[in-house]
């Protein structure tokens, strides 16, 4: 129960992107306004997007103090203009989100093949190590820096005249491969958390291919 | 409870086709990479080939290049084996197996297995 | 693609015996090798990945190790359930390749 013209949000979803993460939920607010706290499991409510007429709020900045925590958020429901008016109970209409654990559960962006190079018959591909927004000593670390032995790179390559992907995986970023003399290959990567049942892979990395820009062929 | 249940095998003629299921139970095969390793009777392993469901990319083993087609159904959690112009020594117990990784061929849980019969 | 040569092919042993099973890469596979158990009529089980880790709930009496490009699982004291066959795998690159088998049989 709240005020006859106030409604408690519903469908809370955590997204979340290399720890960039927003919840989100409805409805759209009809002459209501909407306040966000968030906490970790034995930590104090932290109040966010104070009496917003959004369906979102961006609480990155307090997950990234602790990947690893869990959070909760709640959304509560306001009568627009009279933010001090409470449901029956003496309190604000809310709803809680589901629990998110960042560390466990943010989804993997889609990587980038920053370069690769041929020497011979082998071929190093390097992909492009992300920042995100944790942030330690004032710095922001990369994916790798976050997840460490956690995360692996697939590689999946194939002659440009071929259709079959062939894979190779890396806990760096970098692939060492053997290719053969005088074809032409194509790569796409993607990045993948084993140790995780749910949000396991990224999507994949946009293909690039040998002979255009990013790449350097030398003989030997 | 991971499962991974194959089906559709049986006799068949030389030249003949099948299509063997793999239904998976307890994970999303999204998530995961599937492979199909077959075992001719009392012979070892034999790597068949894989499917990324995420990406749809397959690679198969030089001996069924061309023959064999590996696809995969997210909605029924399912992936499937053609098997077409079949040879007698495509005989075998074919398995479908979780990769523990990410596509590499390391496999954490293997189906029961589906015997697959190339006689006339 | 990448050999993998195993040895023995059979061998006998009695419970309580320490067996050594080893395999050996025709060319660097880091150590990207599982092994793995299959008893008749069975689809095979995961016993060691990566060359040296235990694969969840297998009895510690297993262990993998790795030296270059050979690679050993050690049973340090057979017991009547391991009576199986044993092959190894590399999946360092496209298509994984496994060894010929090695069946451990009572003596």
């Known amino acids: 129960s709240g005020t006859t013209n106030t409604v408690a949000a519903y469908n809370l979803t955590w997204k979340s992107t290399n720890f960039k993460t927003i919840l989100e939920w409805e409805p759209k607010p009809v002459n209501q306004v909407y306040t966000v706290q968030i906490s970790t499991k034995s930590g104090d409510w932290k109040s966010k997007c104070f009496y917003t007429t959004d369906t979102e709020c961006d609480l990155t900045d307090e997950i990234v103090k602790d990947v690893k925590q869990t959070y909760l958020a709640r959304v509560f429901s306001y009568p627009a203009g009279n933010v001090e008016s409470t449901g029956s109970a003496g309190e604000p209409l809310y709803e809680n989100s589901p629990e998110f654990t960042p560390y466990l559960e943010t989804n993997l962006g889609q990587p980038t093949i920053q370069s690769f190079e041929q020497v011979g018959t082998k071929v190093n591909v390097t992909v492009e190590d992300e920042r995100t927004l944790v942030r330690r000593n004032n710095t922001f670390l990369s994916l790798r820096d976050v997840f460490g032995k956690d995360l692996i790179y697939t590689l999946y390559y194939w002659k440009s005249s071929s259709s079959g992907k062939k894979t190779a995986k890396t806990n760096t970023n970098e692939f060492l491969i053997d290719v053969d003399k005088g074809e032409n290959y194509c790569f796409s990567v993607q990045a993948v958390i084993p140790s995780r049942t749910v949000n396991r892979k990224s999507t994949d990395s946009p293909v690039e291919c040998m002979g255009q820009e990013k790449g350097e062929f030398r003989e030997i | 409870e991971v499962q991974l249940v194959e089906s559709g095998g049986g006799l068949v003629q030389p030249g003949g086709s099948l299509r063997l299921s793999c239904a998976a139970s307890?994970?999303?095969?999204?998530?995961?990479?599937i492979h199909w390793v077959r075992q001719a009777p009392g012979k070892g392993l034999e790597w068949v080939g894989y499917i990324d469901p995420s990406n749809g990319y397959t690679f198969y083993a030089d001996s069924v290049k061309g023959r064999f087609t590996i696809s995969a159904d997210t909605s029924k959690n399912t992936a499937y084996l053609q098997v077409n112009s079949l040879r007698a020594e495509d005989t075998a117990v074919y398995y479908c197996a979780r990769d523990i990784q990410s596509v590499s061929g390391e496999f954490d849980y293997w189906g029961q297995g589906t015997l697959v019969t190339v006689s006339s | 693609d990448i050999q993998m040569t195993q040895s023995p092919s059979s061998l006998s042993a009695s419970v309580g015996d320490r067996v050594t099973i080893t395999c050996r890469a025709s060319q660097d596979v880091n150590t990207a090798v599982a092994w793995y158990q299959q008893k008749p009529g069975k689809a095979p089980k995961l016993l060691i990945y990566?060359?040296?880790f235990l694969y969840s709930g297998v009895p510690s009496r297993f262990s993998g190790s790795r030296s270059g490009t050979d690679f050993t699982l050690t049973i340090s004291s057979l017991q009547p359930e391991d009576f199986a066959t044993y092959y190894c795998?590399?999946?360092?690159?496209?298509?994984?390749?496994f060894g010929q088998g090695t069946k451990v049989e009572i003596k």
């Open positions: 990566s060359a040296s």
């Open positions: 795998q590399q999946h360092y690159t496209t298509p994984p390749t």
């Open positions: 307890g994970f999303t095969i999204f998530d995961y990479t």
